[in-house]
């Protein structure tokens, strides 16, 4: 008789990342008997939900169920039926919902309640939806990349799992750029973290980590663009805004009501003598860079050193993984290679921004114009944020690694979030037998 293969003893978990611009569903899988080991969880699926972020459904909450259907049905297909009832589902909402909550707690609660109602009606073990803090977002991103890079493992490996991996236990810093916020998280070198709000203490796999983190709300790429437009329209002499961050020949009409809809532009709000204005691109990197720098207040710092807006930032230390929009934008611009210096990146951006809009549209015919039009701004913003905001230099630039995936799993906060909520990161180094669940972070 033939030997029947035993059914594999695996577990699954689902995390939905409800970002400001869109929602993505991630499915993770791991061997059931190895859940305390480091590096065993891997992503088996990513499903991008069609449509905007959940905060945009505030006036149409009844459409949330339909919005989530395709990706939740995909999860039903990918995960074996026998596992559905045991598969935890988590939804974490980030800065888009933080901003909505700032405007109206009641509206944010309504959106989350309806999201929960939709997700509760699937045959998984739904654990609830919540708005995660910026500190959590930074911390979980840091946990994700270091977990995937094997930095928490005590076993030194003879092989390298990623091209830029140094075979030591020094953790990577995490740089995360979203649409509405950006996070910087790393272990500083023997440096006191001067502001308690930015300090995290972890004990993971038997080792203590003192981690610095900060999330800059309104400094994600989309909200930074709204900020820049709101700042620049203040000094425009009429309803034409000649904008160096858009390609020459590019034109777009913006409603003033849309500009002032977000809490991020409140500080620039003023009564304008027009309801609409037209952006006219002039495509000049240097001027764009200068305009972006005006969003960073570097004149005030109550600490030994700051990033911007009076926020403490210790001296940068070690290698950094830059992911999410840091990666997507730089990948589009073909600037993710380890060999590309900061000077070369700047040169490429100068050339790219100066290219006429008609030429850009022809060269990238398959890309949606809304996204295509914003790469000059986004690329320039990334450089400004990393160099002037976080104080990377031409020399330390080589320590930034633009990462999309590690070992097939997306870099981002979702894996770290799930590892924590499912108690899969033990405080102590696991013995050969699994530990009790009492010592988890």
């Amino acid at each position: 008789t033939q030997n029947k293969a035993l059914p594999e003893n695996v577990k699954y978990g689902i995390v939905l990342d409800a970002g400001s611009s869109h929602t993505s569903l991630y499915i993770y899988k791991w061997p059931a008997e190895k859940e305390n080991d480091t590096g065993v969880v891997h992503q088996v699926e990513e499903c991008r939900v069609k449509g905007p972020g959940i905060s945009k459904f505030v006036q149409k909450v009844n459409e949330i169920g339909i919005y989530l259907t395709d990706c939740m049905e995909r999860a039903r297909e990918v995960i074996p039926r026998s596992q559905h009832q045991e598969t935890p589902v988590y939804l974490g909402a980030t800065a888009g919902m933080r901003l909505l909550r700032m405007e109206s707690e009641e509206l944010a609660d309504r959106v989350l309640d309806v999201v929960e109602r939709s997700l509760s009606n699937y045959p998984f073990d739904f654990q609830g939806a919540r708005i995660i803090t910026g500190q959590e977002e930074g911390a979980y991103g840091w946990i994700t990349i270091n977990y995937l890079l094997g930095k928490f493992s005590q076993k030194t490996r003879w092989f390298s799992i990623v091209p830029y991996e140094t075979n030591n236990q020094e953790t990577f810093g995490a740089l995360d750029l979203g649409g509405a916020s950006t996070q910087v998280t790393f272990v500083p070198q023997n440096q006191t973290i001067e502001s308690p709000d930015n300090a995290l203490q972890f004990r993971l796999y038997g080792k203590d980590y003192n981690v610095y983190t900060h999330s800059f709300l309104c400094y994600g790429k989309d909200q930074a663009l709204w900020q820049k437009l709101a700042k620049d329209i203040q000094v425009a002499s009429n309803e034409i805004l000649r904008d160096p961050c858009f390609h020459p020949g590019y034109k777009k009409v913006v409603n003033v009501s849309d500009l002032y809809k977000t809490p991020c532009t409140k500080r620039f709000e003023m009564t304008l003598p027009f309801q609409q204005f037209e952006i006219q691109g002039i495509g000049n990197y240097q001027q764009c860079h200068q305009s972006i720098l005006e969003l960073f207040n570097t004149s005030y710092c109550p600490y030994s050193q700051c990033a911007f807006n009076g926020i403490f930032l210790p001296p940068l230390q070690g290698d950094f993984g830059a992911f999410s929009a840091f990666y997507f934008v730089m990948k589009f611009l073909n600037l993710t290679s380890e060999k590309v210096s900061q000077e070369k990146v700047t040169e490429m951006m100068k050339k790219f921004c100066a290219q006429p809009w008609e030429e850009i549209k022809t060269s990238y015919a398959g890309v949606k114009e809304k996204y295509l039009s914003e790469y000059c701004f986004s690329g320039t913003y990334i450089l400004s944020l990393l160099l002037q905001g976080y104080h990377f230099t031409a020399d330390s630039w080589e320590h930034i690694h633009f990462i999309g995936k590690i070992q097939g799993s997306d870099a981002g906060w979702t894996l770290g979030y799930m590892l924590n909520l499912t108690n899969m990161i033990p405080a102590e180094q696991p013995l050969s037998t699994p530990l009790s669940h009492s010592t988890y972070v």
Partner: antibody, heavy 119, light 107 residues
């Protein structure tokens, strides 16, 4: 263990009002939603309203103008206010807990409270 | 509103029988259907959700099937304690609606 206990039923005249209460134990109203469902004598079940964990509400449009659902988390109590009562509102009124966080099917029901509308 | 129709109001059965109770939705409800059991003088008890997932503690003689508009609750080996009313419920859209119920009786 999970329990829901309804009260507030009784005999009421047409056109009158009533406030039903549902006291819950074994779970918290900040973690689960609660629905109200009614069952007329010898009839099927009819869904009335839900209040979700953050306080959002939804109603059966057929009753919307005559119903109000609310809750007091500190008292572990959900309320259903019924106005302009009619003879055909005579029924057993149940509160029921969402089986999952905010789902629309129910794993625990109260024993029901009887409302009789009679002139 | 979505109408849930349980065409058989009563069904006569014997202990040991295989019993199938059907429920038809007036429009597509996917698999967003639950089944409840209600004994006289008691409140309903959840048996099945998502059309075919057995709720914890429910004996495995109860199975649910179907999707779209046609749904079935099957009791594979009828027991005397299963004599009760059975209701289907759709939760695909508001208002939530229930079938009229099917009462199982002994032949």
């Amino acid at each position: 263990q999970v329990q829901l206990v309804e009260s507030g039923g009784g005999v009421v005249q047409p056109g009158g009002s009533l406030r039903l209460s549902c006291v819950v134990s074994g779970f918290t109203l900040t973690n689960y939603g609660v629905h109200w469902v009614r069952q007329a004598p010898g009839k099927g079940l009819e869904w009335l309203a839900v209040i979700l964990r953050r306080g959002s509400t939804d109603y059966n449009a057929a009753f919307m103008s005559r119903l109000a659902i609310s809750k007091d988390n500190s008292k572990n109590t959900v309320y259903l206010e019924l106005n302009s009562l009619r003879l055909d509102d005579t029924a057993v009124y149940y509160c029921a807990k969402t089986a999952v966080v905010a789902g629309d099917y129910f794993d625990y029901w109260g024993q029901g409270t009887t409302v009789t509308v009679s002139s | 509103d979505i109408v849930m129709t349980q065409s058989q109001k009563f069904m006569s059965t014997s202990v040991g029988d295989r019993v199938s109770i059907t429920c038809k939705a007036s429009q597509n409800v996917g698999t967003n259907v639950a089944w409840y059991q209600q004994k006289p003088g008691q409140s309903p008890k959840l048996l099945i959700y998502s059309a075919s997932y057995r709720y914890s503690g429910v004996p495995d003689r109860f199975t649910g099937s179907g999707s779209g508009t046609d749904f079935t609750l099957t009791i594979s080996n009828m027991q005397s304690e299963d004599l009760a009313d059975y209701f289907c419920q759709q939760y695909n859209s508001y208002p939530l609606t229930f079938g009229g119920g099917t009462k199982l009786e002994i032949k």
